[in-house]
């Protein structure tokens, strides 16, 4: 299978988390516990 071509495991999981778990109907931006730039988005 094709694999990710990203530099870090954090980036891999960050992008996948946003892909699958961002709540498009919410103003939160993403699910609770998603870290962006070291800040946890609530």
């Amino acid at each position: 299978d094709a694999e990710f071509r990203h530099d870090s495991g954090y980036e891999v999981h960050h992008q996948k988390l946003v892909f699958f778990a961002e709540d498009v109907g919410s103003n939160k931006g993403a699910i609770i516990g998603l870290m962006v730039g070291g800040v946890v988005i609530a």
Epitope: R5, Q15, L17, F19
Partner: antibody, heavy 112, light 112 residues
Framework: QVQLKESGPGLVAPSQSLSITCTVS????????VSWIRQPPGKGLEWLGV???????NYHSALISRLSISKDNSKSQVFLKLNSLQTDDTATYYC??????WGQGIPVTVSA | DVVLTQTPLTLSVTIGQPASISCKSS???????????LIWLLQRPGQSPKRLIY???TLDSGVPDRFTGSGSGTDFTLKISRVEAEDLGVYYC?????????FGGGTKLEIK
């Protein structure tokens, strides 16, 4: 408001290439992954591939030799190219922003 | 590839009654980041699929709380506590833990 719209030919001849454009609005392609998914008539969903915010890609292993996904961030467009089409590539093709926002889909028939 | 097996294929339910759909995976969907990338979609007739639930059990905004998702590892369930007319369509599970991302075959919910 997030929107995605697929455009391209509705009919393609066997052995030819399919090119579909997904034009998006309401978000930046630099920040989000966009995926392509297809659905043959009366059947289920099949994931084709994804292009990430940084431009890297992942493809379905069964299609990796025929499939290419690219994008133009400045035009807010994502492109799918599928080569060597066969009749079983007949399907409605969807682009998605993540898993939560889907385009309306574009029906593509592969026929002589 | 990960195979997602949905049962039943068709579900005929009286309005107001409960419904349950199973999605079983050929391998564990627990990712190395500790999350389980299993989502549920509903495709109403003539429409694009719509995500209902992500990360096994989290409801999308606007999705009625009569829907619940549960499970872990290889066994997952979507339950509707009281079916309404707007719930008819085809339900799909979708895993994003392992490449290639794969879908279940779908469960058609019919209203009696």
């Amino acid at each position: 408001q997030v929107q995605l719209k697929e455009s391209g030919p509705g009919l393609v001849a066997p052995s030819q290439s399919l090119s579909i454009t997904c034009t998006v609005s309401g978000f930046s392609l630099t920040n989000y992954g966009v995926s392509w998914i297809r659905q043959p008539p009366g059947k289920g969903l099949e994931w084709l591939g994804v292009i990430w915010g940084d431009g890297s890609t992942n493809y379905h292993s069964a299609l990796i030799s025929r499939l290419s996904i690219s994008k133009d961030n400045s035009k807010s467009q994502v492109f799918l190219k599928l080569n060597s089409l066969q009749t079983d590539d007949t399907a409605t093709y969807y682009c998605t922003k993540g898993a939560g926002s889907w385009g309306q889909g574009i029906p593509v028939t592969v026929s002589a | 590839d990960v195979v997602l097996t949905q049962t039943p294929l068709t579900l005929s339910v009286t309005i107001g009654q409960p419904a349950s759909i199973s999605c079983k995976s050929s391998q564990s969907l627990l990712d190395s980041d500790g999350r389980t990338y299993l989502i549920w979609l509903l495709q109403r007739p003539g429409q694009s699929p719509k995500r209902l639930i992500y990360l096994v059990s989290t409801l999308d905004s606007g999705v009625p709380d009569r829907f619940t998702g549960s499970g872990s590892g290889t066994d997952f369930t979507l339950k509707i506590s009281r079916v309404e007319a707007e719930d008819l369509g085809v339900y799909y599970c979708w895993q994003g833990t392992h490449f290639p991302w794969t879908f279940g075959g779908g469960t058609k919910l019919e209203i009696k």
